[in-house]
């Protein structure tokens, strides 16, 4: 079998809301993946599991099941959303993200994603990690591919 390539394209949108009383930040982060099937037969994308970390703490998880199938030598673009919560012991971040003296409130998040594909009963997992800047002070949307090179650094695959 030939490879199945997973490419993390970047953040498609980041929508922020706050709970003032609880000093909590809610960030809904939608990411984009390109999955390429280099085989001459179809493969199923069985699931995508994703998590987001801030300062080595997991702040959000998501799982998508029975997503799609990808035809021979085809590529599909898949968006997935991870709801994240920055709260409790990290509530000091609420002060930063709502600071009224500045307009830009960048934080660095680590995006982790694992794609599970199946073909002929065989299962394969491909993982990616990427550090990304997100502005926790406002909503942000991107045109396709606009955020492709936003990584702070790319860890070894």
């Amino acid at each position: 079998p030939r490879s199945i390539d997973v490419k993390y394209i970047g953040v498609k949108s980041a929508y922020v809301s706050y709970d003032v009383q609880k000093r909590t930040i809610y960030l809904n982060i939608t990411n984009t993946l390109n999955i390429t099937n280099n085989n001459y037969y179809s493969v199923e994308v069985e699931n995508i599991t994703a998590q987001v970390q801030f300062a080595k703490t997991v702040i959000g998880k998501a799982r998508l099941n029975n997503i799609t199938h990808i035809g021979p030598l085809d590529m599909k673009q898949i968006d997935y959303t991870v709801p994240t919560v920055i709260a409790e012991e990290m509530s000091y971040m609420y002060d930063f993200c709502t600071l009224i003296s500045i307009k830009v409130h960048n934080i660095v998040l680590m995006m982790q994603v694992t794609v599970t594909t199946t073909y002929f009963g065989h299962s394969e997992q491909i993982s990616q990690e990427r550090y990304q800047y997100v502005d926790c002070g406002r909503n942000t949307t991107y045109q396709l591919g606009q955020s492709e090179y936003l990584n702070v650094l790319q860890p070894q695959q």
Epitope: V104, N106, D135, R138, N139, T140
Partner: antibody
Amino acid sequence: EVQLQQSGPVLVKPGPSVKISCMASVFTFNDYYIHWVKQSHGKSLEWIGLVYPYNGGTNYNQNFKGKATLTVDTSSRTAYMELNSLTSEDSAVYYCARSYFSNPIGYWGQGTLVTVSE
Amino acid sequence: DIVMTQSPSSLSVSVGEKVTVSCKSSQSLLNSGNQKNYLAWYQQKPGQPPKLLIYGASTRESGVPDRFTGSGSGTDFTLTISSVQAEDLAVYYCQNDHSYPLTFGAGTKLELK
């Protein structure tokens, strides 16, 4: 429908001060920054500053420090701007507006015309 | 403070015409972290408050017709109206949404030929 209801037009003499108001309805007052913007007749827009109703925190344009004072009364869901040492240069339409925290200013009041004249 | 320079100051147009308004900032409005440009465009009709059209340099506010397009990066930005309608006659302002104090361009007045 979201509303920022501003007080009516005022005609004042040069010298003391004037206080104009902006009452919020249909949205959570504490969840938004309230901005004040000046528009002199036929001119562009000048950002005066903002106030955060939740804690009364303010951020002023240095050009308006000492000229404008921004306050809020959360019980009546009203933001206020007081202009002091009035001169004819202060004659303008003053808008209050809101933004969801650091998002762009998305909604504006109808404006209050302040005329400073003898 | 960031100075916003708009051109032209006024524009005479016919209905159906394509229009471009230019805006230059004295400092970059790019958030180098997330690669978004923090520039907004507002439309103001006579006797009315400004209305947000575009934010993040290129994202249309909900309900804004798709004939309005924002583009540009860093210090150079453009608002394009692909086919001007009678209801588009107004003054258009660009605004620095990157740092305080928020600053506006002098405006571009769209008039009917």
